[in-house]
Interface confidence: low
């Protein structure tokens, strides 16, 4: 049960810079979760979602022809996903394999909190969950061609909620 | 196959403007990277500018605000329009097609020659 398991939470850092405006617009995401079998640790980037496939948007990264645009310059990047369609680890694979420092899956029900997100086995590549309404927040920028930079550092560490009766 | 033929190459005086285009033929695949490199005598190959086919745009630090990267998904042509053209931007300018997210370019053009005379 997820509410049993002891996680992490995330404390997210995001920084948009918008045409025509001068300083950067700077936000703190709340209730960022990492992955149980994610590195508990600090990476920063800037975030990419897929490339469209097929002429439709691809926002969940389950595709095996998934594509993402990453810039010459830029030397770490976090693939944006929402939650969906297959699995965690196969999301997160799919982004390790084209590099990614980092993956943020938002979740794909707006009520819902993170949950700790399990995938075995995908290694040194850090994986968090955010709200729908936060990761929509994100990629509405991103459709806009709007350079979006990411800083994920660990929070607080929740231990598990005991269930035992009378407590 | 891809195959890439650049046009739009010259000699131009500094200050002035010259406008590339890079037609991408043969078999392509819907989603793809295209982008402008160039190589100086004596230099190795730079990055330019590049466009994801959403019209994300990059463009190197030397050439930001001075060059413009377009690009035409019915014709598969990318476009460079080069003003306020400087001798240091001399160079041969290579069309390339990317595939894949990771800048291995598997398809590059022959290349036009760019001159800026002082």
């Known amino acids: 049960d997820n509410a049993s398991q002891e996680y992490y939470t995330a404390l997210i850092n995001v920084t948009v810079q918008e045409p025509g405006r001068g300083a950067p617009l700077t936000f703190r995401i709340d209730r960022g979760r990492y992955g149980l079998d994610s590195p508990k640790a600090e990476v920063r980037g800037q975030v990419l979602a897929p490339l469209p496939l097929h002429g439709v948007a691809d926002h969940l990264g389950c595709d095996p022809q998934t594509r993402f645009f990453v810039p010459p310059n830029i030397k770490q990047w976090i693939a944006l996903l929402q939650r969906g369609n297959c699995t965690f680890k196969e999301k997160i694979s799919r982004a390790a394999f084209h590099n990614a420092v980092a993956v943020v899956i938002y979740n794909n029900k707006s009520k819902e909190e993170p949950v700790t997100m399990t995938h075995p086995g995908t290694g040194d590549i850090i994986a968090v969950m955010i709200t729908e309404l936060r990761g929509k927040d994100i990629l509405s920028y991103l459709e806009k061609n709007i350079s979006v930079q990411m800083t994920i550092a660990v929070g607080t560490r929740m231990p598990p909620k005991n269930f035992s009766r009378g407590s | 196959q891809v195959q890439l033929q650049e046009s739009g190459g010259g000699l131009v005086q500094a200050g002035g403007s010259l406008r590339l285009s890079c037609a991408a033929s043969?078999?392509?695949?819907?989603?793809?990277?295209m982008g402008w490199y160039r190589q100086a005598p004596g230099k190795e190959r730079e990055f330019v500018a590049s466009?994801?086919?959403?019209?994300?745009?990059y463009y190197a630090d030397s050439v930001k605000g001075r060059f413009t990267i377009s690009r035409d998904n019915a014709k598969n042509t990318v476009y460079l329009q080069m003003n306020s053209l400087k001798p240091e931007d001399t160079a041969v300018y290579y069309c390339?097609?990317?595939?894949?997210?990771?800048?291995?370019?598997?398809?590059w053009g022959q290349g036009t020659q760019v001159t800026v005379s002082s």
């Open positions: 390339a097609v990317d595939f894949d997210s990771n800048y291995a370019h598997t398809y």
């Open positions: 466009i994801s086919y959403g019209a994300s745009t």
């Open positions: 043969g078999y392509i695949s819907g989603y793809y990277v």
